[in-house]
């Protein structure tokens, strides 16, 4: 039975040209995290493997940095980066947990972080 929950940074906004940290945290389970995949729409941005470390997609090599922790840092943001991002936790023995973050990239400087929320 999957008992874990994923807490994410929720709905967030950031300024064009700036950077943002995407964070997820898996709690309420003793399952072992084997790998975390970060996806944007239908693209795989990055992989963090518990044993092997980080790999960044060749498509995003220049704009994505690993961390902090299991999070992901997006740099040189453009308006096209607006959209849904998913952290996909592959765990044993539970299986897969998915968290969702919505990022809005703004032209102006009124970018503010939204509230945190949980996805069971």
């Amino acid at each position: 039975m999957m008992t874990g929950t994923i807490e994410t940074t929720g709905n967030i906004s950031a300024e064009k040209g700036g950077s943002i940290i995407l964070q997820c945290h898996l709690s309420s389970t003793t399952a072992q995290v084997t790998q975390v995949n970060w996806e944007q729409q239908d693209q795989l941005l990055a992989i963090c493997n518990a044993d092997l470390g980080w790999h960044i997609s060749p498509s995003f090599k220049d704009r994505v940095a690993p961390g902090p922790g299991l999070g992901l840092t997006l740099q040189s943001l453009t308006v096209n980066d607006t959209g849904e991002y998913f952290c996909i936790y592959h765990t044993y023995p539970d299986g897969t947990y998915t968290g969702r973050i919505f990022l809005e990239v703004l032209e102006s400087s009124v970018a503010e972080h939204g509230a945190r929320f949980q996805i069971p």
Partner: antibody
């Protein structure tokens, strides 16, 4: 069992067009990013195209950019490569390959289909 | 573009031998390297990904190592079915590139 079966190869004149297909089975096709890779006779491997799992993003090397188009139909479990303005140097066996779910490497490949560009 | 240079291009060895193939990247690719085996008229098969991780079902006699620019594929004890051509590939950045191949032949 993962299976990728290419088809559509053949003899085509320089400047002509051809559409290759790759039929996928044994896995949930829509969950995987896909590639085309080619191999000229007696030569090494050359990456030709990439498409994301939903078909939104595509990438090509400069050698084929503007001439080749990769696409997919997830409802039909099929991958395609539309090739136009073909040149003699495009002669090769064309393989479709699946991107691993663990990494960005290509974990399963088809047997390939031969494309010969000659007058 | 990142060049992947394999050496040697040809290698003669006997069953039971320990064999090492090297691959040098023209710039740092971290551990974004895979190794493939290809037999004549057949599709390539993934052996190693992430520079050192064995793909499902690959025998333990195959091992990969390295990071940055220098990588090796080692076959600890050659078996008859291992005679084939081996390719390294980098997937750190586009365009994805392969080494020119190493043909492993029976001595």
């Amino acid at each position: 069992e993962v299976q990728l079966v290419e088809s559509g190869g053949g003899l085509v004149q320089p400047g002509g067009s051809l559409r290759l297909s790759c039929a996928a089975s044994g896995f949930t096709f829509s969950d995987y990013h896909m590639y085309w890779v080619r191999q000229a006779p007696g030569k090494g491997l050359e990456w030709v195209a990439y498409i994301s799992k939903g078909g939104i993003s595509t990438y090509y090397p400069d050698t084929v950019k503007g001439r080749f188009t990769i696409s997919r139909d997830n409802a039909k479990n099929s991958l395609y490569l539309q090739m136009s303005r073909l040149r003699a140097e495009d002669t090769a066996v064309y393989y479709c390959a699946r991107q691993s779910s663990y990494d960005f490497a290509m974990d399963y490949w088809g047997r390939g289909t031969l494309v010969t560009v000659s007058s | 573009d990142i060049q992947m240079t394999q050496s040697p291009s040809f290698l003669s060895a006997s069953v039971g031998d320990r064999v090492t193939i090297t691959c040098k990247a023209s710039q740092d690719v971290g551990t974004s390297v895979a190794w493939y085996q290809q037999k004549p008229g057949k599709a390539p098969k993934l052996l190693i990904y992430w520079a050192s991780a064995r793909h499902t079902g690959v025998p333990s006699r195959f091992s990969g190592s390295g990071s940055g620019t220098d990588f090796t594929l080692t076959i600890s004890s050659l078996q008859p079915e291992d005679f084939a051509t081996y390719y390294c590939q980098q997937y750190s950045s586009y365009p994805l590139t392969f080494g020119q191949g190493t043909k492993l032949e029976i001595k």
